[in-house]
Interface confidence: low
């Protein structure tokens, strides 16, 4: 079928415009072109016989228009008044007769539009602006664009007049933005320059910083004051309500007591007429005196006495601070405040205590702190300790004794041998030790201030023979996988070697064992039941050796998984069912039985007499280890048979 | 002289991270509260955060809550506010002040280091 494509089929005045012919019938004699959308002879633009390759033009012929050979036709520089229908006429070499029609719209070129506004100065919160999209066009679409994006939705914002015009009523100040409009119509698009709102507004209230209200005598004051406004907001200062100066900072320097008031700042907006006003207090502290701490009682005796340390000067309407350790109060129940906090009481004073103690006078800017206080805590003597820690001492050697108590002042010693009085000092030395020096040491510590004595014995055997060692154990009853245990060769003797043996044989090589203490603890790690053997300890020196009676370990393990015999699980109907169980479990364990979940009887042994099938079922042996703690259990399926139905199955007896 | 001194600021983007400094002279740190105040155009004065060493509190604006630290070592007489997981309202220009312990009343500013959080 004859058909007619326009491209483009939207055509901007100007330019031009191609009327394409599709399936052009074969055997032509010629075609004409008509205006219209019927064949006219008044409106023919153009006819064309294919003989003679002759264009013939008609009444409509406008000297824009160009015939193809192939019928197609193109209109160039396009006007207004080339829109509408063109029709096609085409003459077969039978002289039938073929039409077609097309058609093509024109629309002009945009000009660049531009924005017109009734208001170029608007009141914030009280005028509305209108802008309008000049010029008026026909068939052209407007659009508006604000900072280059398309309106937000907002009740305040108004498009009237086919969107020629858009209203911003209520104008606020974040309306200030640049503002754009385009036309738009099937051939071009424009935009407009942008537009800036300007919109008045403010002065707000105004803020004065700092915001810092205290200061001390001597320091300068310099305030600024800042309102929102446009255009910029004029300033001026009073103080107590008396006008100072108009400007923006207000500046007195090495202020005094005097100075303390209220400051107010006014802001003024010319062109909205409006002021407002924001007014802070100011307030002038003198110069505190720097505090320093007394003390009830500079010697406190540790347990006994209390302390309470005041911080001076008393100042009325004063915040007071305390640290210790350079900490703030820890909350304790042996430390009190005061309800001014000016005294701080240490109930009960250890030697913990000493401090050291500030106190602190805060003002409104910063605190004024005291020089710090150490208490002298009275204490001691703790019981004293007498090294070396060696009991067992060789003839012939020098005895050295050293004796060391806590105290506060430091303790005086005193030493005494078989409850004779030696010497007062904190060292013993006695040479060339022989066996009548054996005997029972005591060290006698002395606190002069609080009065108190402690004391400490230790026994000193001098002698060539070694003494026969024994084991002791820090763990005598220790858990499988879990505990460790540590065995210690007793006593300490100087100048001696400690030899181990665990089953008559000397000590395996293992990275559980570990020797510590110049060999005198063996320390055995997450021990084992097969650690529970006979463990033997020895001491030697140059002169003899001895050793120890064994110590057997006992460790306590399981119970392992239980094992249920006769491992048999199917019975005749008649016999007697006997099953035993046993896990393996250091200390025994506790055995109980559960048929079908349903507990039984708590032995070692179930017996049940002339089963029948109602006998069917889950059997479930329970274990426990009081001492371990640990649980375990089996559960085995028994099936009873009708007499006769089981071939080749025992029963249990 | 009470001197203030920051530093630490610059260009980061968001999500990143800074620390800045206030170096004190002329007073004990320990005595008194230090703050950070921000500055930016178009926003109000902003107490971020603040630092009492000597009854130890530390107080936030709860637009920095969980992203601001404030701390402050007494040995170097520094005060320090590391800012994690920054935003692009964090712009600003920070000053180290003097704070008073209960109210946002700042003294003794310093110069100001500025903070740029951009992409």
């Known amino acids: 079928k004859l058909t007619i494509e326009s491209t483009p089929f939207n055509v901007a005045e100007g330019k031009e415009v191609l009327l394409l012919v599709h399936n052009l019938p074969q055997h032509l004699f010629g075609y004409s072109w008509y205006k219209g959308e019927r064949v006219d002879g008044n409106r023919q633009i153009i006819g064309y016989v294919i003989g003679t390759q002759q264009a013939t033009p008609g009444p409509a012929y406008s000297g824009r228009e160009i015939i193809y050979p192939n019928a197609s036709l193109l209109i160039q520089n396009i006007i207004q008044n080339d829109t509408g229908f063109y029709t096609l006429h085409v003459i077969k070499s039978d002289l039938v007769n073929e039409e077609a029609t097309g058609q093509f719209r024109v629309y002009p070129e945009l000009p660049k539009p531009s924005i017109s506004s009734n208001n170029s100065k608007p009141v914030e919160d009280k005028d509305a602006v209108a802008f309008t999209c000049e010029p008026e066009t026909q068939d052209a679409t407007y659009l508006w664009w604000v900072n280059n994006q398309s309106l937000p939705v907002s009740p305040r914002l108004q498009l009237s007049n086919g969107n020629r015009t858009l209203t911003l009523f209520n104008v606020t100040r974040n309306d200030t933005a640049s503002y754009k409009c385009e036309t738009q119509n099937p051939v071009s698009a424009r935009r407009s320059d942008s537009v800036i709102l300007n919109v008045l507004y403010g002065p707000d209230a105004p803020t004065i910083s700092p915001l810092n209200t205290s200061y001390r005598s001597g320091e300068n004051l310099n305030l600024s004051c800042h309102a929102a406004s446009n255009p910029p907001a004029q300033y001026s200062w009073f103080v107590n309500g008396t006008f100072q100066q108009s400007t923006q900072e207000l500046f007195i320097p090495n202020i005094t007591v005097n100075n303390s008031g209220s400051y107010t700042c006014q802001a003024h907006n010319s062109d909205t007429g409006l002021n407002r006003t924001t007014v802070t207090t100011i307030t002038v502290y003198a110069e505190p005196p720097k505090p320093f701490i007394t003390s009830n009682n500079s010697n406190p005796v540790e347990d006994e006495d209390a302390v309470a340390l005041t911080c001076e000067p008393e100042i009325q309407n004063t915040t007071y601070l305390w640290w210790v350790n350079n900490q703030s109060l820890p909350v304790s129940p042996r430390l009190q405040l005061s309800n001014d906090n000016r005294t701080l009481t240490l109930l009960s004073v250890t030697r913990n205590d000493v401090g050291p103690y500030e106190c602190g006078i805060q003002n409104e800017l910063s605190v004024d702190h005291s020089d710090p206080v150490i208490l002298n805590v009275l204490y001691g003597p703790d019981d004293p300790t007498i090294s070396p820690s060696y009991t067992y001492y060789r003839p012939g050697v020098n005895l050295s004794l050293s004796c060391h108590a806590a105290s506060n002042p430091p303790a005086q010693y005193s030493w005494l041998i078989d409850g004779n009085i030696q010497q007062h000092t904190q060292e013993l030395f006695i040479s060339n030790i022989t066996e009548k020096n054996s005997g029972l040491y005591t060290c006698q510590a002395n606190n002069s201030a609080s009065g108190h004595s402690r004391t400490t014995v230790k026994t000193i055997t001098v002698s060539a023979e070694l003494p026969k060692p024994s084991i002791s154990s820090n763990n005598s009853k220790p858990v499988e996988d879990k505990d460790a245990v540590a065995f210690t060769c007793e006593p300490e003797a100087q100048n001696t070697t400690y030899l181990w043996w665990v089953n008559g044989q000397s000590l395996p090589v293992s990275p559980r064992l570990q020797l510590s203490n110049g060999n005198r603890t063996l320390t055995l790690f997450n021990v084992t039941r097969n650690d529970a053997r006979a463990y033997v300890c020895g001491i030697q020196n140059s002169v003899s050796a001895n050793r120890s009676d064994p110590v057997t370990l006992d460790v306590l393990y399981g119970p392992d998984t239980p094992i249920i015999s006769p491992p048999d699980s199917s019975y005749l109907s008649g016999a007697n069912l006997n099953l035993s169980c046993h896990s393996a479990s250091n200390p025994s364990p506790q055995y109980s039985w559960r048929i079908n979940g349903i507990p039984q009887q708590h032995t070692q042994v179930l017996f049940i007499a002339k089963i029948t099938p109602n006998n069917n079922g889950t059997y479930a042996c329970f274990v426990s280890n009081l001492a371990t703690g640990r649980n375990n259990s089996i559960v085995k399926s028994i099936t009873v048979s009708a007499s006769g139905t089981s071939p080749g199955l025992s029963a249990g007896a | 002289e009470v001197q203030l001194v920051e530093s630490g600021g610059g260009l980061v983007q968001p999500g990143g991270s800074l620390r800045l400094s206030c170096a004190a002279s002329g007073f004990n740190i320990k005595d008194t509260c230090i703050g950070w105040v921000r500055r930016a155009p178009g926003k109000e004065e902003e107490l971020v955060a603040q630092i009492c060493q000597y009854h130890g509190s530390t107080r936030y604006a709860d637009s920095v809550k969980g992203r601001f630290t404030i701390s402050a070592d007494t040995s170097k007489n520094t005060a320090y506010l590391q800012m994690n997981s920054l935003r692009a309202e964090d712009t600003a220009v920070y000053y180290c002040?003097?704070?008073?312990?209960?109210?946002?009343?700042?003294?003794?500013w310093g110069q100001g280091t500025t903070v740029t959080v951009s992409s």
């Open positions: 002040a003097i704070v008073g312990q209960n109210y946002p009343v700042y003294n003794y």
